[in-house]
């Protein structure tokens, strides 16, 4: 509550608003007949700073000199203390401490565009905590002066609202800013400049790009600029890049040829302008122009691989696979792939365009020497064809890589290692490591992956299209001229025990032994590469440990004979599967009683 000072007065000298570090005099005096029982000697006047007693005096008035007040407001209260009564508030005072303005620093002025107005900015320095009036003065030739004021605690910008013209671009102008508040004043150092120093051109506009004859090598960038612009700088980058290419040009007159753009690439272009070689400042960058460069015919060659599959005595199936060209090699949208199949001795050739796929399957006779060529085509032309002779990739046993192993290498990676073939290792021209998901049916629709490795390498890390808990059939081919040798292994990047055991679907009796047939475990339940199956059996109603037979896992196998069962005894049989991580739960149980005679 604001006290009305009915009992007395508080006066403050020199003011309620003082400079940081200065002294303030506070006087508290009682009005007539407002003391203790009218006995002045009993009056005890006490001065509080906030809630802390800082001075007292017996009598009608109290005078106190106060120093060291902090920035901001400090509250003083004068109270009267009489014997046997509570202190009575007489009057209060708030003293506000601020600072005089510091010298404004780094005064700089700018005119945005030839038609813009002069505006200046500066650094105010330390906060004064007080209303401070800033006056900006500009003086020019012929004793012309302009002045603008801003009355705000936080003023650091003023626009004169006048336009400097290029009639006499070398004429000097001087700007100065003065800050004044109730505690003092300070002026900046003068800033002297010419028209050319302070005019920052507007950014270029209406940016366009033209490709003569739809060719990336004949590209011109066009733009519009203010009339006095002398210099431009251009920057451009592919839209997916963070790094800019930079070009400086003089007297470009709104056009520049660009020679190093890549085809079929979206670029971002920006331009900035300047009026003078070494005076003034660059404009802001223009708005971005985004444009796609035209296509060029593909470069590079496709990476092609193939698989052969025997159909019957006279026919074989050839499946060709190839990898997409990289963006920089495709140099455009690949419209189709051209596959040419040729019988080398008879000269018979067949050409087909493939769209939307990177594979092709056909059936050819088992006789004759066959070759294929595959190329990629965009709107401007085709890549050089990749030619390969179709051969039996695993025919040369002496070229087969040795000691092939496949080990998990972190998440979704498999490290394949091998030893060179026994035959002269220097004959190997390259290794190809091929992998595909293992499907018990040998499904040819399963995607094929491959990578090429130099002849001196004996390992490869495969990571493309590798999933956890999936078993891959991995082959390593050693190629030499028109011969090849191969070795294969199963591998997985991560494994655990299978989720289920095989399902026994039939038990048949054959000459005193039995043949157990089962259904493969679904691929998604195998949880990696299977190493073994186990067949368990025990007499029905017996508490004895079951007997077992462990069979190495082979992809195509789904039956196995057992000849150690006694005739006319009922047995319970079941199966499990094992990966390197452990054994599955039981599959289904089947009962069987052998009818034949005991051996």
């Amino acid at each position: 509550k604001i006290d009305a000072c009915k009992r007395g007065d508080v006066t403050v000298k020199p003011s309620h608003v003082i400079l940081l570090g200065s002294t303030v005099n506070i006087t508290c005096s009682l009005k007539p007949r407002q003391g203790c029982f009218h006995y002045s000697r009993r009056n005890k006047l006490i001065l509080y700073k906030f809630d802390r007693r800082i001075n007292f005096h017996h009598g009608h008035s109290l005078n106190s000199q106060v120093t060291g007040l902090p920035l901001g407001t400090t509250l003083f209260v004068c109270k009267l203390a009489c014997i046997n009564s509570d202190e009575i508030q007489i009057c209060g005072a708030e003293i506000f401490v601020g600072v005089a303005p510091e010298q404004p620093q780094n005064l700089s002025c700018i005119q945005k565009g030839e038609q813009g107005t002069v505006a200046c900015t500066w650094e105010r320095g330390r906060d004064t905590h007080l209303y401070t009036e800033y006056t900006l003065q500009l003086s020019g030739p012929k004793n012309l002066t302009w002045q603008k004021q801003c009355k705000d605690i936080y003023c650091d910008y003023l626009d004169f609202g006048i336009n400097l013209t290029p009639e006499s671009p070398e004429s000097n102008f001087t700007a100065k800013v003065t800050a004044v508040n109730s505690l003092g004043s300070s002026s900046s150092l003068p800033s002297t400049f010419t028209f050319l120093d302070i005019v920052r051109p507007l950014p270029p506009w209406d940016i366009r790009i033209k490709f003569q004859k739809a060719s990336v090598s004949r590209c011109t960038l066009y733009w519009r600029d203010e009339g006095l612009v002398l210099l431009n700088r251009l920057r451009y980058r592919p839209s997916n890049s963070r790094l800019w290419n930079m070009v400086n040009v003089t007297k470009a007159k709104g056009r520049h040829d660009l020679l190093d753009l890549k085809p079929f690439t979206e670029y971002e272009f920006q331009i900035s302008s300047k009026l003078h070689l070494y005076k003034g400042s660059w404009s802001d960058w223009s708005e971005s122009l985004r444009a796609q460069t035209p296509e060029e015919e593909p470069t590079g060659m496709l990476d092609v691989w193939y698989m052969k599959r025997h159909i019957d005595y006279s026919r074989q199936q050839i499946s060709l696979f190839w990898k997409n060209l990289s963006v920089s090699e495709a140099r455009g949208k690949i419209l189709h792939y051209q596959v040419t199949l040729q019988e080398l001795t008879g000269g018979k050739a067949m050409t087909q365009n493939i769209t939307g796929h990177t594979s092709w399957t056909t059936v050819i006779p088992r006789t004759g020497n066959w070759a294929v060529a595959v190329s990629a085509a965009n709107s401007k032309g085709s890549s050089l064809p990749t030619r390969i002779n179709i051969m039996n990739l695993c025919e040369a046993g002496l070229l087969a890589p040795r000691q092939v192993s496949a080990n998990s290498e972190g998440m979704d990676n498999i490290l394949v290692t091998w030893q060179p073939p026994r035959k002269d290792p220097s004959a190997v021209q390259e290794y190809v490591v091929e992998w595909r998901e293992l499907h018990p049916g040998g499904d040819t629709q399963v995607p094929l992956n491959w990578l090429r490795s130099r002849p001196y390498n004996v390992s490869a890390l495969i990571s493309e299209n590798i999933k956890s808990y999936i078993c891959y059939e991995i082959r390593v081919y050693a190629l030499s001229g028109d011969q090849g040798g191969c070795s294969s292994i199963l591998g997985n990047s991560k494994h655990k025990a299978p989720l289920s055991g095989p399902h026994i679907n039939a038990i048949t009796e054959e000459k005193g032994s039995i043949l157990i047939s089962w259904n493969s475990i679904p691929v998604q339940e195998q949880m990696g590469c299977l190493l073994h199956y186990r067949i368990y059996w025990k007499e029905r109603d017996s508490n004895s440990q079951p007997q077992l037979c462990e069979i190495p896992y082979r992809v195509s196998q789904n039956s196995h004979p057992i000849n150690s069962l006694q005739p006319r005894v009922t047995y319970v049989l079941w199966m499990t599967a094992l990966t390197a991580a452990g054994e599955s739960s039981h599959g289904n149980e089947r009962e069987f009683c052998l009818q034949g005679k005991a051996n």
Partner: nanobody, 119 residues
């Protein structure tokens, strides 16, 4: 910001009295200090008297004992009672209000009222 309107100025003979009134309108909350300043022709503007919202006062040495400043916080009015006027008191008298603005003070000024003391 606050708007200030001064009244009560005029022509008076030496030894006479005048009462100046300043009324604050607009966002007049948190006015910390209300002051009277004066500016004689060709001179700097100087503090005459000020009164804080708690009632404490400050007077220029040249007017102490002759001038009294008072303030009605409820009505946002500040009065300057000027007695025993002298010719050297002739000036334009300006009202000023200092308001809290965050941890700073923001000032507002009136347009002034002319006081002329003839001898």
């Amino acid at each position: 910001q606050v708007q200030l309107q001064e009244s009560g100025g005029g022509l008076v003979q030496a030894g006479g009295s005048l009462r100046l009134t300043c009324t604050a309108s607009g966002s007049a909350a948190l006015i910390f200090l209300m002051s009277w300043y004066r500016q004689a022709p060709g001179k700097q503007r100087e503090l005459v008297a000020e009164v804080s919202r708690r009632g404490s006062t400050t007077y220029a040495d040249s007017v102490e004992g002759r001038f009294t400043i008072s303030r009605d916080n409820a009505k946002n009015i500040v009065d300057l009672q000027m007695n025993s006027l002298k010719p050297e008191d002739t000036a334009v008298y300006y009202c000023k209000a200092d308001q809290y603005y965050g941890d700073s003070l923001r000032s507002s000024w009136g347009r002034g009222t002319q006081v002329t003391v003839s001898s």
